[in-house]
């Protein structure tokens, strides 16, 4: 018996608008109906929780109103989008999946997605 497997892309480049999207896929050992997904960021030996959502299978993924994350779920796959990113937010973003109900509880952690964020160059002043 091993930890639940969670897959996510190794690298993602955020858009010029500071938006990064990636898929978090988990191999569910059972028929979970309630799943909790948490995005963690590891950088400079610090770990912070970026966002978290609990959802019922087949229902929409709902983050808190002030969350920088949005997402959708489809089967054992979660499509995550993080917005408002700046260069200083570059780091390893880890997908943590917990199968909350029904028992037994399972925990899986992905190997992390390195998100690179490059601040856009300011537009040069125009003479026109």
């Amino acid at each position: 018996c091993k930890a639940m497997h969670v897959a996510q892309p190794a690298v993602v480049l955020a858009s010029s608008r500071g938006i990064a999207s990636f898929v978090c896929e988990y191999a569910s050992p059972g028929k979970a109906t309630e799943v909790r997904v948490t995005v963690l960021r590891q950088a400079d030996s610090q770990v912070t929780e970026v966002c978290a959502a609990t959802y019922m299978m087949g229902n929409e993924l709902t983050f808190l109103d002030d969350s920088i994350c949005t997402g959708t779920s489809s089967g054992n796959q979660v499509n995550l989008t993080i917005q408002g990113l700046r260069a200083m937010d570059t780091g390893l973003y880890i997908c943590k999946v917990e199968l909350m109900y029904p028992p037994p509880y399972y925990l899986g952690i992905g190997n992390g997605t390195q998100i690179y964020v490059i601040d856009p160059e300011p537009c040069p002043d125009s003479d026109f």
Partner: nanobody
């Protein structure tokens, strides 16, 4: 699936010792980091120590006093607590995290990575 059960809490005088045990069933401990955490009344849950196959890590407040070890044959992790102080009084929890290649000595004990939390055992240090 992993199931953890901890034991060994109790009342001890300052300067005394206690040993906590965290026994796993349903899985071998091998692919997991096992951590000990504690929570005092009105405070956040904090890291005490953790151990994987090859490394251990401790909170600064317990270094030199507490020792974490694992016995794979018994599928059990131990926390030997010596020179106990009043400030060590708390509910102690055992938890597990899948061991990951990106864990560092500084992050492998971070509570965000853990699950399979036990109910907790009370440790009280008082004369």
């Amino acid at each position: 699936e992993v199931q953890l059960v901890e034991s060994g809490g109790g009342l001890v005088q300052p300067g005394g010792s206690l040993r906590l045990s965290c026994a796993a069933s349903g899985s071998t401990l091998d692919p997991f980091v096992i951590g000990w955490f504690r929570q005092a009344p009105g405070k956040e849950r904090e890291t005490v120590a953790c151990i994987n196959r090859s490394r251990t890590s401790y909170a600064d407040s317990v270094k030199g006093r507490f020792t974490i070890s694992r016995d794979n044959s018994k599928n059990t992790v131990y926390l030997q607590m010596n020179s106990l102080r009043a400030e060590d009084t708390a509910v102690y929890y055992c938890a597990a995290s899948p061991d990951k290649p990106f864990y560092t000595d500084q992050t492998m004990c971070n509570k965000h990575y853990y699950g399979y939390w036990t109910q907790g055992t009370q440790v009280t240090v008082s004369s």
